[in-house]
């Protein structure tokens, strides 16, 4: 099994792979496969209205750049506070036990799968112990070394919206041969995309295929830039006792996902007011919608907040409210 | 390509039970409304209401509240109405629909489930 | 009895403008959308919101709003245009949505 993967992302579409080779390997090791596959944002962030009181946004982190050859892992993504600093809890005995215990049985697995389980994978029909996964057609990069330009992800994960996740079946996952080296690039990825990466050391090229199990690593892309910007004008209806209805387009392609909307609007000479409208609320109108306006001149600005941060504000919008007796609520629904 | 498929025609009797689907897909499904419309033969067509997939989060007209219960699975992109006792009045055209485009709008059709409840 | 009221037929001349028609109170605050269906078919989403029209939808369709009336528009009407007509809002209430009763357009 190839040794402590680390991912890191340098930019909004490439993840860095480095690894070491295995410790003890069965013969000498021809080449690594390197896979990698789109994860799907935790179910549990489009489920959350962060406009509650008291609800802190996820503050997603992408994996950082490499500290040094010897760095820890920076692979998972995790909540931080807002000052992104993140401090594990002291642990217990009985985890530090588990711990001991744990490290232990790695040794023993590990022995276990280079005698048992590094076994042939048949890329053709046959008997005996196959991958009994689909065989793939792989681009080979050779013996050249230095060569990491990696397959595209556009075509196995086309954008459908600015949050779907494709499932593609298993055989159409994208993936690597290395040859003489423990590093890959990996190119053409999505911005703010958490993948999955599985890494195999391969002991034999042809006729038969020799793998070992995978080891897996998590990393996430870097943010774009303006991918969180609303494109386009905010639109407004006024319509009787001064409802105005505030519309806009959502990001088309923006980091993870939308949370939330801001509005920010003021009546001319007073002071701004804010306003949040929740990814759902904004899937019903569009938009939103104020009530009990004074009379008066208003500009209205908006920006996104997605799990990568805000957005930029538009450019304001301005309407004017005429005088009317009866003031209601704030938020229409 | 967004597409909401539904499942087949229904033939059922008088106090059975029902459940009909709607499977999205070409889009984020946790990230819009779904709602059912009923087409009664030779009328016009009355909302139902309406779920949102991300929380569950269900809103049924007065007409039929009650009378109907509207579900989704997320993990399989899947909005279902169902019946615990069908009526021969329930016999009608059911369409899911999703809000998008605009304010209360339903921008994206399923094909239709024919419920015929007969006895 | 719905809150949203249609001329239930209305019959237009080939290539000739006509104005299908939906009246409640509550469009007074809020929006309308229009649906076209076609016989045996699933409706259509025609026109939403001021007057914005989902892509694929002909330039001769557009919709407007004065007070608690919305309308839908067809300048030149084409066979093809010959349909039911929904419209659609929100209650009074603003909770829920409702439809207008259609209107069946025929084009002479």
């Known amino acids: 099994v190839p040794l402590d993967p680390i991912s890191v992302s340098n930019s909004s579409s490439q993840i860095i792979l480095k690894w070491k080779p295995p410790s003890d390997p069965n013969g000498n090791i021809t080449h690594y496969l390197v896979f990698w596959e789109r994860q799907a944002e935790d179910s549990e962030l489009f489920e959350l209205d962060y406009c509650l009181k008291g609800l802190k946004l996820p503050s997603r982190t992408w994996s950082p750049p490499f500290e040094s050859e010897d760095s820890q892992k920076h692979n998972q993504s995790e909540y931080e506070d807002s000052a992104g600093e993140c401090c594990s809890c002291p642990k217990t005995d009985s985890q530090i036990l588990k711990e001991l215990e744990e490290s232990s049985f790695r040794k023993t697995f590990e022995d276990y799968l280079h005698n048992v389980v590094f076994v042939p994978r048949k890329t053709s029909s046959g008997t005996g112990a196959e991958d009994p996964r689909p065989s793939r057609k792989r681009r080979s990069l050779g013996d050249v070394g230095n060569v990491t330009v990696a397959v595209p992800t556009v075509a196995a994960f086309p954008n459908t919206s600015s949050t779907s996740v494709p499932t593609s079946p298993e055989e159409h996952r994208p993936f690597e041969k290395v040859v003489n080296k423990e590093s890959l690039v990996i190119s053409g990825l999505r911005h703010f995309t958490g993948y999955r990466i599985e890494l195999q050391a391969c002991n034999q090229d042809t006729p038969e295929e020799r793998c070992s199990v995978a080891a897996y690593v998590s990393a996430r892309t870097m943010p774009e830039a303006k991918a969180d910007d609303i494109v386009g004008p905010v639109t407004h209806e006024i319509f009787e006792n001064n409802v105005v209805h505030l519309m806009w387009q959502e990001p088309k392609e923006p980091n993870g996902l939308i949370v939330l909307y801001e509005v920010s609007y003021r009546r001319y000479g007073d002071e701004e007011l804010h306003l949040c409208v929740s990814r759902k609320h904004f899937a019903l109108e569009r938009g939103c919608r104020l009530r009990g306006l004074s009379p008066g001149n208003y500009s209205v600005r908006i920006r996104a907040t997605s799990l990568a941060g805000n957005g930029s504000w538009t450019e304001p919008t301005y309407f004017y409210v005429t005088d009317y007796l009866d003031v209601p609520s704030n938020i229409a629904k | 390509e967004v597409q909401l498929v539904q499942s087949g025609a229904e033939v059922k009797k008088p106090g059975e039970s029902l459940k009909i689907s709607c499977k999205g897909s070409?889009?984020?499904?946790?990230?819009?409304?779904i709602g059912w419309v009923r087409q009664m033969p030779g009328k016009g067509l009355e909302w139902m209401g309406i779920?949102?997939?991300?929380?569950?989060?269900?809103r049924y007209s007065p007409s039929f509240q009650g009378q109907v219960t509207i579900s989704a699975d997320k993990s399989i992109s899947t909005a279902y109405l169902q019946w615990s006792s069908l009526k021969a009045s329930d016999t009608a055209m059911y369409y899911c629909?999703?809000?998008?485009?605009?304010?209360?709008?339903?921008?994206?059709w399923g094909q239709g489930t024919l419920v015929t409840v007969s006895s | 009895s719905s809150e949203l009221t249609q001329d239930p037929a209305v019959s237009v001349a080939l290539g000739q403008t006509v104005r299908i028609t939906c009246q409640g109170d509550s469009l007074r605050n809020y929006y309308a959308s229009w649906y076209q269906q076609k016989p045996g078919q699933a409706p259509l989403l025609v026109m939403y919101d001021r007057n914005s029209r989902p892509s694929g939808i002909p330039d001769r369709f557009s919709g407007s709003r004065s007070g608690n009336t919305a309308s839908l528009t067809i300048t030149g009407a084409q066979a093809e245009d010959e349909a039911d007509y929904y419209c659609?809002?929100?209650?009074?209430?603003?909770?829920?949505?409702?439809f207008g009763g259609g209107t069946q357009l025929t084009v002479l």
């Open positions: 629909a999703r809000l998008g485009s605009g304010s209360y709008s339903f921008d994206y």
């Open positions: 779920i949102y997939p991300g929380d569950s989060d269900t």
């Open positions: 659609n809002s929100r209650d009074s209430s603003g909770n829920h949505a409702v």
């Open positions: 070409g889009y984020s499904f946790t990230s819009y409304w």
